[in-house]
């Protein structure tokens, strides 16, 4: 098993990037002189225990920021978070941490990022540029849940 | 408030199977873990195994691999011990408890109370 | 498959330090067995204080804090006072399993 995460970058079908801005992850244009953030990726090591068919189930933190994604209840509402988080404490954990866990799916180029605390809701991007990172469970409407990963070697 | 309950105490024959039921109250039983774990006078604990609610995938000890099976019907919040094949080596009280991740680490926070099974002819 | 071993029995007084240990007969136990303490009183009454080797549960009071010392998890309380009189057992992770220690019976006195 890897036990050291892969580094990537990630930019949706509109070639927008992920950017750090206020600890919050947005989505912009590429533009000169802009440092898109590089993720760092890990599969879970329990990955027996969890769904089968649903896809990869990893940890996406943000390379070298000691920063993670996570979903979690804001009310009824699934949100997509950014914790200060080592992602190998994640992965070294006993149990699979839920909250802080997606399932990755490729299909050709596409990535997608499923919640696997909250099965149906998934990493997106509004339609419109310079929004944060949401969670959604309308796919293919007015939001972006198609992103293109490439690993970093 | 966050409660396991877990069901009455039982006398079954040496052979037999039993269930046991541990039901969660006061929180979402789809957010943690359940597990199971034995106790026998002077003996200590014995971690039986655990049961994802949510998904319903779990892991036991090997020693009672084959022996226990754990379920769960999440429509009741309730998780299920079925022992089968029962021996007087089978006579403990056995209880749940939750297995929660909470800031940095999991922990076995809440317990139920236990459940009492007795294997006697 | 590892045995877990605690002291069986402690006393110590109002107001004193005691500490508890947890062993693994596999080796020395390290932060990747991730500890867990938990606490029984009369009458089936269990409570978890200690996950991840030194971290406390929700609620837990502050004189409950775990520890590895020298190749063993700990359990101290700084400060015992009566109602910490208990049965308390450790727990430790092997990979893909848990193994509880046989408890530890501290009377305050």
């Known amino acids: 098993k890897i036990d050291t995460p892969q580094r990537g970058s990630i930019q949706d079908i509109n070639h927008r990037v992920w950017v750090l801005q206020d600890q919050t992850l947005i989505a912009v244009p590429r533009k000169d002189r802009m440092s898109p953030v590089t993720i760092a990726l890990i599969s879970c090591r329990h990955v027996e225990t969890l769904e089968k068919d649903r896809g990869n189930p990893i940890y996406l933190g943000l390379n070298g920021l000691n920063l993670c994604l996570m979903c979690a209840k804001v009310g009824d509402q699934p949100t997509l978070q950014l914790k200060e988080k080592d992602i190998m404490d994640l992965y070294n954990q006993p149990e699979p941490v839920k909250s802080f866990l997606f399932y990755h799916s490729q299909s050709g180029r596409n990535s997608t990022f499923e919640s696997v605390a909250f099965p149906g809701w998934f990493i997106a991007v509004s339609s419109e540029g310079g929004c944060p990172l949401i969670l959604t469970q309308e796919l293919g409407k007015a939001n972006t849940t198609d992103f293109g990963l490439t690993m970093l070697f | 408030e966050v409660q396991l309950q877990q069901s009455g105490a039982e006398l079954v024959k040496p052979g037999a199977s039993v269930r046991l039921s541990c039901t969660a109250s006061?929180?979402?039983?789809?957010?943690?873990?359940i597990h199971w774990v034995k106790q026998r006078p002077e003996q200590g604990l014995e971690w039986i195994g655990r049961?994802?609610?949510?998904?319903?995938?779990?892991r036991y000890d090997p020693k009672f691999q084959g022996k226990a099976t754990i379920t769960t019907d999440t429509s009741s919040d309730t998780v299920h011990l079925q022992f089968s094949s029962l021996t007087s080596e089978d006579t403990a009280v056995y209880y749940c408890?939750?297995?929660?991740?909470?800031?940095?680490?999991?922990?076995?926070?809440?317990w139920g109370q236990g459940t009492t099974l007795t294997v006697s002819s | 498959q590892a045995v877990v071993t605690q002291e069986s029995a402690l006393t110590t007084s109002p107001g004193e330090a005691v500490t508890l240990t947890c062993r693994s007969s596999s080796g020395a136990v390290t932060t990747s067995n991730y500890a867990n303490w938990v606490q029984e009183k009369p009458d089936h009454l269990f409570a978890g204080l200690i996950g991840?080797?030194?971290d406390r549960a929700p609620g837990v009071p502050a004189r409950f804090s775990g520890s590895l010392i020298g190749d063993k998890a700990a359990l101290t309380i700084t400060g015992a006072q009566t109602e910490d009189e208990a049965i308390y057992f450790c727990a430790l992770w092997f990979s893909n399993h848990w193994v509880f220690g046989g408890g530890t019976k501290l009377t305050v006195l």
């Open positions: 991840g080797t030194n």
């Open positions: 049961i994802d609610p949510a998904i319903g995938t779990t």
């Open positions: 408890a939750r297995l929660h991740y909470f800031g940095n680490n999991f922990f076995f926070d809440y």
């Open positions: 006061g929180f979402n039983i789809k957010d943690t873990y």
